[in-house]
């Protein structure tokens, strides 16, 4: 049944030229997590398969990288960077959850790391 | 329009294998939200569940049938086949394939149909 | 394996009746419950989902009721292109099971 839910870092922000991991984590489900579709807007970043692995986009290679975990690094930010995130679970029976992460790439060091909330 | 279409043998004799394959055309069958699975009914009676697959190859079989169940996926011929070994006159049915489409909040359904091949098992 | 348990087996009704056909499932499936309609050597064809949700392109004429065990199809006004036999389905918890079917028949 779709019992689950989806924590994730929720709002960031991280500083031009660095880098950042979007995370998130599915919780209170036993259904088989078969893939995790990571997306910015319209925008396939990246692909991991539970029996393929990792697929990044290729216009995303030199930028993303997988992991850790489900998660993803971003690198080489740049302020068209700042947006919304989406992980996509696709489970079996479940079938799709879904979470959001906004990221705002600032130009000064007073980035600061938003609270984890929850996604029902 | 996405369609579905069974093919294999009618008539399958008692204690061997039904081998059917599943034809995806209108769509890929290596779509992440898209699960593939088989659904079968015998004569003037239910429908049954029998398993289901993932483009990568991840399955779900009924545990009625599982000792003697295969699903594989060929997505390079856009196709999903059924293996149900040890046959008897009890699995004589109309045999569907099916997409089940994930959509989030409403879960897995069985939304596209194959239009059923009927496997006689007899001798 | 929840048992989906339909009734009644056969109902004969006209053309312009309010149908209704009831499904019980042997233990709570919260709303995660879909109705299909099956004609005579055709394929299930997917009706309501998640209890009560018209599917798309579906007639406005069906409507799905209920959670945790007991559901309800509602055809509000019975038309000939309805006449068929139709199963519910739970597909919260492996294995997915179907009822065992309602056939609606012209009186």
């Known amino acids: 049944m779709m019992t689950g839910t989806i924590e994730t870092t929720g709002n960031i922000s991280a500083e031009k030229g660095g880098s950042i991991i979007l995370q998130c984590h599915l919780s209170s489900t036993t259904a088989q997590v078969t893939q995790v579709n990571w997306e910015q807007q319209d925008q396939l970043l990246a692909i991991c398969n539970a029996d393929l692995g990792w697929h990044i986009s290729p216009s995303f290679k030199d930028r993303v990288a997988p992991g850790p975990g489900l998660g993803l690094t971003l690198q080489s930010l740049t302020v068209n960077d700042t947006g919304e995130y989406f992980c996509i679970y696709h489970t079996y029976p479940d079938g799709t959850y879904t979470g959001r992460i906004f990221l705002e790439v600032l130009e000064s060091s007073v980035a600061e790391h938003g609270a984890r909330f929850q996604i029902p | 329009q996405l369609q579905l279409q069974e093919s294999g043998p009618g008539l399958v004799k008692p204690s061997e294998t039904l081998s059917l394959t599943c034809t995806v055309s209108g769509g890929s069958i290596a779509s992440s939200v898209y699960y593939w699975g088989w659904i079968r009914q015998p004569p003037g009676k239910g429908l049954e569940w029998i398993g289901s697959i993932y483009y990568s190859g991840s399955t779900w079989y009924n545990p009625s049938l599982k000792s003697r169940v295969t699903i594989s996926v060929d997505t390079s011929k856009n196709q999903f086949s059924l293996k149900l070994s040890s046959v008897t006159a009890a699995d004589t049915a109309v045999y569907y394939c099916?997409?089940?489409?994930?959509?989030?909040?409403?879960?897995?359904?069985?939304?596209?149909w194959g239009q059923g091949t009927l496997v006689t098992v007899s001798s | 394996d929840i048992q989906m348990t339909q009734s009644p087996s056969t109902l004969s009704a006209s053309v312009g009746d309010r149908v209704t056909i009831t499904c019980r499932a042997s233990q709570s499936i919260s709303s995660w419950l879909a109705w299909y309609q099956q004609k005579p050597g055709k394929a299930p064809k997917l009706l309501i989902y998640k209890a009560s949700s018209l599917e798309s392109g579906v007639p406005s004429r069906f409507s799905g009721s209920g959670s945790g065990t007991e559901f309800t199809l509602t055809i509000s006004s019975l038309q000939p292109d309805d006449f068929a036999t139709y199963y519910c389905q739970q597909y919260g918890i492996l294995p997915r099971t179907f009822g065992g079917g309602t056939k609606v028949e012209i009186k």
């Open positions: 099916a997409r089940e489409a994930g959509r989030t909040g409403t879960g897995l359904l069985f939304d596209y």
